[in-house]
């Protein structure tokens, strides 16, 4: 029995609903009484949802899953996952048994956009050319881990003296703090770009130092 799922991961934003598509081709005369359908987590084999003996057996996964009962007879074994959270990310296996047996796995990629970065400067007063300053770029509650890029006012990448840390909060979302140590020129703009690699979403922050005062666009 051929079971079909999408090749590419299903991308879902945290808090939204996702559909994990799975289909099979029922033979003429097929009835739901013949169908055994199991969704499980591929990595741990934990049961997620099942259908057997003509009945939806319900969600075994935090009561956040549902089948599409009206579409099962047409070979649609897709699973609806509600209120997606970081802990859902991973591979789900769809097992279908009628007379024959088939299975396939579909990946769920969870994502959350990063906030607009906030910029802080240390020290933040009495700055002169030649002073070493620490610029911190902070962006919050994104997923998965961000890519962080720094550049100067001319668009030249700044790769030295950068330290980036990413810590997950209780919801599994990452807070990113990237620190650039730089020797000040006469004046200058320093920008950080926080990129979500899954959403291809960029969040920008910058600070311009012009002797006195400083501005934070």
């Amino acid at each position: 029995l051929e079971v079909q799922v999408p090749e590419d991961p299903v991308v879902a934003l945290v808090g939204t609903d996702a559909t994990l598509c799975c289909s099979f081709s029922p033979e003429p005369g097929f009835s739901l009484a013949q169908l055994n359908l199991i969704w499980q987590l591929t990595d741990t084999k934990q049961l997620v949802h099942s259908f057997a003996e003509g009945q939806d057996q319900g969600s075994a996964y935090a009561n956040r899953t549902a089948l599409f009962p009206d579409l099962l007879a047409q070979g649609n074994a897709s699973l609806r996952l509600q209120r997606v959270r970081v802990a859902d990310e991973g591979s789900f296996t769809c097992f279908v048994s009628i007379r024959d047996f088939g299975s396939a796995a579909v990946s769920l990629q969870v994502a959350a956009p990063y906030s607009k970065p906030s910029m802080t400067l240390e020290p933040n007063k009495d700055l002169r050319p030649g002073d070493t300053v620490t610029i911190t770029c902070s962006s919050y509650r994104g997923y998965p881990e961000a890519e962080v890029f720094w550049q100067d006012g001319q668009g030249v990448p700044l790769t030295g003296n950068v330290t980036t840390s990413q810590m997950a909060n209780e919801q599994g979302l990452f807070d990113v703090h990237s620190v650039l140590r730089v020797v000040l020129g006469a004046n200058g703009t320093y920008s950080c770009l926080v990129r979500n690699p899954v959403l291809q979403q960029d969040a920008h922050g910058s600070v311009t130092i012009t002797g006195q005062p400083m501005t934070f666009p």
Partner: antibody, heavy 119, light 113 residues
Framework: QVQLQESGPGLVKPSQTLSLTCTVT?????????WNWIRQHPGKGLEWIGY???????SYNPSLQSRVTISRDTSKNQFSLKLSSVTAADTAVYFC????????????WGQGTTVTVSS | DIVMTQSPDSLAVSLGERATINCKSS????????????LAWYQQKPGQPPKLLIY???TRESGVPDRFSGSGSGTDFTLTISSLQAEDVAVYYC?????????FGGGTKVEIK
């Protein structure tokens, strides 16, 4: 900053049940994490025992499944390990550890507690 | 279960020199849908719990010095310490995070020559 701390008796008699508790501070055990038990036999490698997830579901190492129970007390922000019918082969350092979602690597560990099985 | 085999068992390297540890899995740890290898590396010092260094084969954990790097794909993986420091003396473990039960290699002890 999340911290994990194991506690329980350091000496258990053969055939009895080993009971350990892991207390989690600064993070709720109902957040999007799995809470694991891992052990290390003296001078040897690491063995994953099992986990309890944010939702309360559990999974155990098949090699220990018949003897292991992992449970939790959300009001105390603790999770516990029970290993029954212990023998000298269960003498080890027992660690609790946290993994993010279904990323099954272990980011935060407790310091570990030594359990000796001996009469 | 996936069996993880590390080599060598121990390794003596001069300060400032490169240390290379190998890890082989009994089946592929590459997930085709996201092209990620589900392998982690840990460092353990005496009397301490293991410390996560690398996950997804090559992603450095926050705060880990960039002299530590991970590479490899499928069944063959390597942890490299580009310039060994005194504080790197420890036992290093690989772990597959692909399929339960999660399993570890037997460890490689790194010492100063």
């Amino acid at each position: 900053q999340v911290q994990l701390q194991e506690s329980g008796p350091g000496l258990v008699k053969p055939s009895q049940t080993l009971s350990l508790t892991c207390t989690v501070t600064d993070y709720s055990i109902t957040g999007d994490y799995a809470w694991n038990w891992i052990r290390q036999h003296p001078g040897k490698g690491l063995e994953w025992i099992g986990y309890i997830s944010y939702s309360g579901s559990t999974s155990y190492n098949p090699s220990l499944q018949s003897r292991v129970t992992i449970s939790r007390d959300t009001s105390k922000n603790q999770f516990s390990l029970k290993l029954s019918s212990v023998t000298a082969a269960d003498t080890a350092v027992y660690f609790c550890a946290r993994s993010l979602g279904r990323r099954w690597y272990f980011v935060v560990w407790g310091q570990g507690t030594t359990v000796t099985v001996s009469s | 279960d996936i069996v993880m085999t590390q080599s060598p068992d121990s390794l003596a390297v001069s300060l400032g020199e490169r240390a290379t540890i190998n890890c082989k899995s009994s089946q592929s740890l590459l997930q085709s849908s996201n092209q990620k290898n589900y392998l982690a590396w840990y460092q353990q010092k005496p009397g301490q719990p293991p410390k996560l260094l690398i996950y997804f084969a090559s992603t450095r954990e926050s705060g880990v010095p960039d002299r530590f790097s991970g590479s490899g794909s499928g069944t063959d993986f390597t942890l490299t310490i580009s310039s060994l420091q005194a504080e790197d003396v420890a036992v290093y473990y690989c772990q597959q995070h692909y399929s339960a039960p999660w399993t570890f290699g037997g460890g490689t002890k790194v010492e100063i020559k």
